[in-house]
Interface confidence: low
């Protein structure tokens, strides 16, 4: 029998390279059976994840899975960082793996920092 637990299908260490000024949709793939769970996005700030309450979000329903989408219209340089979605279902909180956005500011034409740079300069994630 198929499990009816809510599942969040963000892959571990997933990342996206995006341009400042472009629109972007960050998807949280959600699998559920009956009641759609309450899903939220948050942005990592150190060890805490700050809820993104005032950002535009929407649901996209596919046949076998749904997507809770965080809209960036447009992407801003300070959108750089790591995000996580979480689902509240039957009093359980299920958290996804984090997904990282690497925002390239077109004006400065800077390249995406390398993983080594990100490791040595973690504040880049929260700028």
């Amino acid at each position: 029998k198929e499990s009816c637990d809510v599942q969040l299908y963000i892959k571990r260490q997933s990342e996206h390279s995006i341009l400042a000024g472009d629109p972007f949709e960050l998807e949280c793939p959600v699998k559920y059976c009956a009641n759609r769970p309450h899903v939220t996005w948050c942005k990592l700030n150190g060890t805490t994840c700050v809820k993104l309450e005032d950002r535009q979000t929407s649901w996209k329903e596919e046949k076998n899975i749904s997507f809770f989408i965080l809209h960036f219209e447009p992407v801003l340089p300070n959108d750089n960082g790591s995000y996580r979605c979480s689902a509240n279902f039957q009093s359980n909180l299920i958290e996804s793996h984090s997904t990282t956005l690497y925002v390239t500011d077109v004006k400065s034409a800077s390249e995406r920092p390398s993983k080594d740079e990100m490791a040595s300069r973690p504040w880049l994630l929260y700028s």
Epitope: R36, H38, T40, S91, L93
Partner: antibody, heavy 127, light 107 residues
Amino acid sequence: EVQLVESGGGVIRPGGSLRLSCAASGFTFDDYGMSWVRQAPGKGLEWVSGINWNGGSTGYAASVKGRFTISRDNAKNSLYLQMNSLRAEDSALYYCARDYYYGPGSPNYFYYAMDVWGQGTTVTVSS
Amino acid sequence: DIQMTQSPSSLSASVGDRVTITCRASQGISSWLAWYQQKPEKAPKSLIYAASSLQSGVPSRFSGSGSGTDFTLTISSLQPEDFATYYCQQYNSYPRTFGQGTKVEIK
């Protein structure tokens, strides 16, 4: 068990004030928006006011705007409705209800249905 | 504000009957409609959300359908505990608004 218990109702003269409280238990209070819904004797349901998880967004029915104030204290798992300048037409059974995100767009106070209700507290405005 | 109009306002039915209640929105609300059941002296109970999704724990004899402006709540085989007042509510736009209610009485 998920539970909402309202208190603070009573008999008050027109122009007076009352503060309703709603004590929540059995769920993570600050994961949810909350609403007040009222029902005048022998009448239907009327949404009065709503508030998001952290109090950053509030909304009011036109009939109470400027007179009622919704607030919450997440540390106390409590929701409040401060009612000023009360009128005879405010006489009703006031229900506290938990909001659940079932809808489109930004998760804000008006994109929710109500999934859990308290038993209500009665407000009578009479001279 | 969006006006929600339910019909009929009341109906009489017998145990085992199929009962249909309709709800019409004054403008399109996609599928963002909920149904609630309220028994005398009790708080409302959530039955259906998103027009057709059954709330957890609600018997399968309840079903909802519709989108846009026209919606239906159906009770496939009325049970004694189903005699109550039913309300629809839109949550597509601010402020949330309810229908006036449909009272289901025993014939």
